[in-house]
């Protein structure tokens, strides 16, 4: 059951997994969310009826009946996990803690104008996981406006305590708001020679990423496959750190494999949610329940609804045994991951999915694209959407994406002449046009939210946000797209899509079903020499072939230019404008999404 | 035809600086490693510094640390050496080279034909 | 850092004789090892990787073996264009890339 709210003075009594600092309740609950087997948690505020040493502490609990008792207790605030709820759920955490000193080791002390500049120092910091700004009212003359950027082997403070006229915060890298790079590649045959701060079992180097992604101290890591010779290291997990933040040395070694943490863009990739199964694997670990099950998809269901589950392994029935049901082992540890693991028993083994809401549900795989044709069919495309116009008579105006449960990106220029919100109205899950009815439903546009620097579409900034009036439950026909990561500027994408309704050429008319064209980017570069007249700048993306033919036309405007990366689909480019439509050597012009992340940012996770 | 084209090498006084290109073509620039390797003359092979496909991960010999900088432009398909604070024993010819695929070939599979960059007073 | 050694600096050979060059590695590098020559004025040119795999383009006459510390490159019979400077590398532990010392091959 989900219980999302605080009780204050309220105490649970015993059930301690472990003891960390932080600065408030509401992040108490975050870290106890994140942790493999919190499910309760109590933190102690500050209170002169309280012992200073235990202000800020934050107490991880964990109980067999998924509660415990309550004891009422001045500056207590207790509260459950919320790995019971449904609700999508984010370790972003952008507030600043006035008059708060986070310690940890601080390796790295500068002089900064502000708290925001130092938050963002230690955004793009690799090893930074929070710090203390010192204001320029801090009685220490030496010390003002020093900005100190801290880490802790848990990700969160060794201790909190109160002092006057500093501020401390977290690295906002879990916000998708860092510019380091993503090194999303998977190295063969390659060991890392650098420091371990810790080891897992993972059944293979993807999970082993993902761990290390989620884990707070660790940057890269390497992976010794099942077929390693050393029998005792098979499905070894090593995390690993480094001073300047990369492997100081790599060896070329058979059968194991390297990588780097996704920290940085881990809002684009899926880092909980390990959906496998790994056939003719036991995985071992601490048993919670033993359950018959018709197949191991039906065991991975159990565990996902075992809150305390973490991870199963399924032993398919003996041929006329049980009614055909095998048996299912739920197990859970105390890291998350298996103690060990076995091949060549039978078993079938994976993870519970009940973690995959951590994760952004832009990551959600979805259905394979038809390949050839240029018609779309329903949910190739989820994240699309098909905005209409009521005035003077409904049309479709243009396209647009959806980004999260209450956003649609798309561009500015599309709402040129529109007076009020009021008579937009955004279809989602659409194929056709011709779907679109009286009684379709529909949601209202509460605000739009155009970026204040655009004049026109050819000199840029051609980008809006509209904020719905209602919130969009996510299916396999409408669900978000993932923004592309500031980490991964230097990506080459390959396989771009436009999608819309727009006109198929110049004179035309808006098309019935969603219409689909494979097109490859152009450098900047090479854009520029196709439009002398325009200045192409960085805020800008474009794409066509050479030859034309395929091309956004009129009506595609603000509608996304989708590229697959690593299995999942980034919003790379808003349709904007273009000379003509599919002409030849005249690519179309889009805007350049992750030049606006900040921007998007910043516009919807305002308070 | 594939191949590599090193430019920007010349005589520098010590302590001053040079910015080197190597110019890729016949191939799809952005998946690979790519490395600088120098040779003093009359001398052997020495490796300078690797830059990593996408750019984010770089080395650099202990002898170059700090005072040169390898970059690309996979949009330009260009590889560059800022190198400042020369010192006479930077004299050499500076080769880009390309590394083979991973897992099948680690080797330097491609050169450039080289720049030679002199630092004298 | 891994050293490499080569033996000998130079020798002198003949049209059509069989050349033996060995390096040794200052650790076991498994089989990462490569060959290159390279002549007066020119770039080095990749001849064997992996130890003993023959990069593409390049004469049957060289090959390469061996596998640890000791590994060998051997042209079979020695032809005019194969007087240059061979130099192995070890690609095992990175950074740095080492190369030996070079071998001269002479008339």
């Known amino acids: 059951e989900c219980v999302t709210q605080l009780l204050k003075d309220t105490c649970f009594e015993g059930g301690d997994i472990t003891t960390v600092f932080t600065p408030s309740a509401k992040y108490c609950q975050v870290v106890c969310t994140y942790h493999p087997r919190c499910l309760l948690f109590t933190f102690t505020a500050e209170s002169p009826s309280e012992d200073p040493t235990r202000w800020f502490t934050c107490v991880l609990k964990d109980s067999v009946t998924e509660t415990l008792p309550r004891v009422n207790r001045t500056a207590a605030i207790s509260g459950y996990s919320f790995k019971q709820c449904s609700h999508q759920i984010s370790a972003c955490n952008k507030d600043i803690y006035v008059d708060l000193d986070m310690k940890g080791i601080n390796y790295n002390s500068s002089v900064a104008k502000s708290a925001q500049e130092c938050q963002e120092r230690c955004t793009d910091d690799v090893h930074c996981h929070f710090f203390t700004y010192a204001t320029r009212q801090f009685p220490s003359l030496e010390h003002r406006n020093i900005c100190l950027l801290k880490h802790t082997q848990t990700g969160t403070p060794t201790r909190i305590t109160k002092l006057d006229k500093v501020v401390s915060g977290f690295s906002l890298k879990s916000c998708a708001l860092s510019n380091l790079a993503c090194i999303r590649d998977i190295f063969p045959n390659t060991v890392f020679a650098d420091s371990n701060i810790d080891s897992v079992m993972a059944p293979d180097a993807f999970v082993c990423g993902r761990i290390c992604t989620h884990h707070p101290g660790c940057l890269f890591f390497t992976f010794f496959s099942q077929e390693w010779p050393k029998e005792s290291q098979r499905n070894l997990c090593l995390l690993k750190t480094s001073e300047s933040g990369l492997p100081s040395t790599r060896i070329k070694k058979s059968k194991a494999l390297s990588g780097f943490s996704l920290q940085s863009c881990r809002h684009s990739i899926p880092v909980f949610c390990h959906s496998s199964f790994y056939h003719d694997t036991d995985f071992l670990g601490e048993e919670l329940d033993i359950v018959a099950a018709k197949s191991h998809e039906a065991c991975q269901k159990l565990c996902t609804n075992a809150v305390r589950c973490q991870f199963f392994t399924y032993t398919p029935a003996q041929a006329s045994c049980n009614e055909g049901k095998g048996k299912c082992y739920l197990k859970l540890s105390s890291n998350g991951s298996p103690t060990k693991i076995l091949h060549g028993r039978g078993g079938i083994s994976g993870y519970t999915l009940r973690l995959c809401k951590m994760d952004n549900e832009c990551t959600t795989k979805i259905k394979p694209r038809i390949v050839g044709g240029t018609a779309s069919v329903r949910g190739e495309w989820p994240w699309q959407v098909t905005l209409h116009t009521t005035s003077p008579t409904q049309r479709h105006l243009c396209g647009g994406s959806i980004i999260g449960n209450q956003w649609i990106l798309t561009a500015a220029h599309c709402f040129y002449g529109v007076e009020s919100p009021k008579i937009l109205r955004v279809y989602s899950g659409i194929l056709n046009q011709s779907e679109i009815k009286e009684d379709t439903s529909f949601f209202g546009v509460q605000e739009i939210i155009i970026h204040d620097q655009y004049k026109m579409a050819e000199s840029g900034y051609d980008i809006a946000l509209l904020k719905l009036e209602t919130t969009v439950n996510y299916t396999d026909s409408q669900r978000p797209i993932c923004l592309p990561s500031k980490g991964d500027r230097n990506v080459i994408y390959t396989d771009c899509w436009v999608t819309g309704w727009g006109y198929r050429k110049l004179r035309d008319k808006i098309q019935n079903t969603l219409q689909k064209a494979k097109i490859p980017l152009v450098t900047n570069e090479e854009c520029q020499k196709r439009y002398r007249g325009h200045k192409i700048t960085h805020k800008m993306i474009c794409a066509g072939y050479r030859e034309g033919g395929k091309d956004a036309c009129k009506g595609d405007s603000g509608g996304p230019l989708s590229c697959k990366h690593n299995e999942v689909w980034h919003l790379v480019g808003i349709t904007s404008w273009g000379e003509g439509c599919a002409q030849r050597e005249r690519p179309g012009v889009y805007t350049n999404v992750v030049e606006y992340v900040d921007w998007i940012l910043e516009k919807t996770q305002a308070v | 035809e594939v191949q590599l084209l090193e430019s920007g090498g010349g005589l520098v006084q010590p302590g001053g600086s040079l910015r080197l290109s190597c110019a890729a073509s016949?191939?799809?620039?952005?998946?690979?490693?790519m490395h600088w390797v120098r040779q003093a003359p009359g001398k052997g092979l020495e490796w300078v510094s690797s830059?990593?496909?996408?750019?984010?991960?770089?080395d650099y010999a202990d002898s170059v640390k700090g005072r040169f900088t390898i970059s690309r432009d996979n949009s330009k398909n260009t590889l560059y050496l800022q190198m400042n604070s020369l010192r006479a024993e930077d004299t050499a010819v500076y080769y880009c080279?390309?590394?083979?695929?991973?897992?099948?070939?680690?080797?330097?599979?491609?050169w450039g034909q080289g720049t030679m960059v002199t630092v004298s007073s | 850092d891994i050293q490499m050694t080569q033996s000998p600096l130079s020798l002198s050979a003949s049209v059509g004789d069989r050349v033996t060059i060995t390096c040794r590695a200052s650790q076991s590098i498994s089989s990462y090892l490569n060959w290159y020559q390279q002549k007066p004025g020119k770039a080095p040119k990749l001849l064997i990787y992996?130890?003993?795999s023959l990069q593409s383009g390049v004469p049957s006459r060289f090959s390469g073996s061996g596998s640890g510390t000791d590994f060998t490159l051997t042209i079979s019979s020695l032809q005019p264009e194969d007087f240059a400077t061979y130099y192995c590398?070890?690609?095992?532990?990175?950074?740095?890339?080492?190369f030996g010392q070079g071998t001269k091959v002479e008339i």
């Open positions: 830059i990593y496909s996408s750019g984010g991960w770089t």
């Open positions: 016949g191939f799809t620039f952005s998946p690979y490693w």
């Open positions: 992996a130890a003993s």
């Open positions: 590398q070890q690609s095992y532990s990175t950074p740095p890339w080492t």
């Open positions: 080279a390309r590394e083979g695929v991973a897992g099948t070939n680690d080797a330097f599979d491609i």
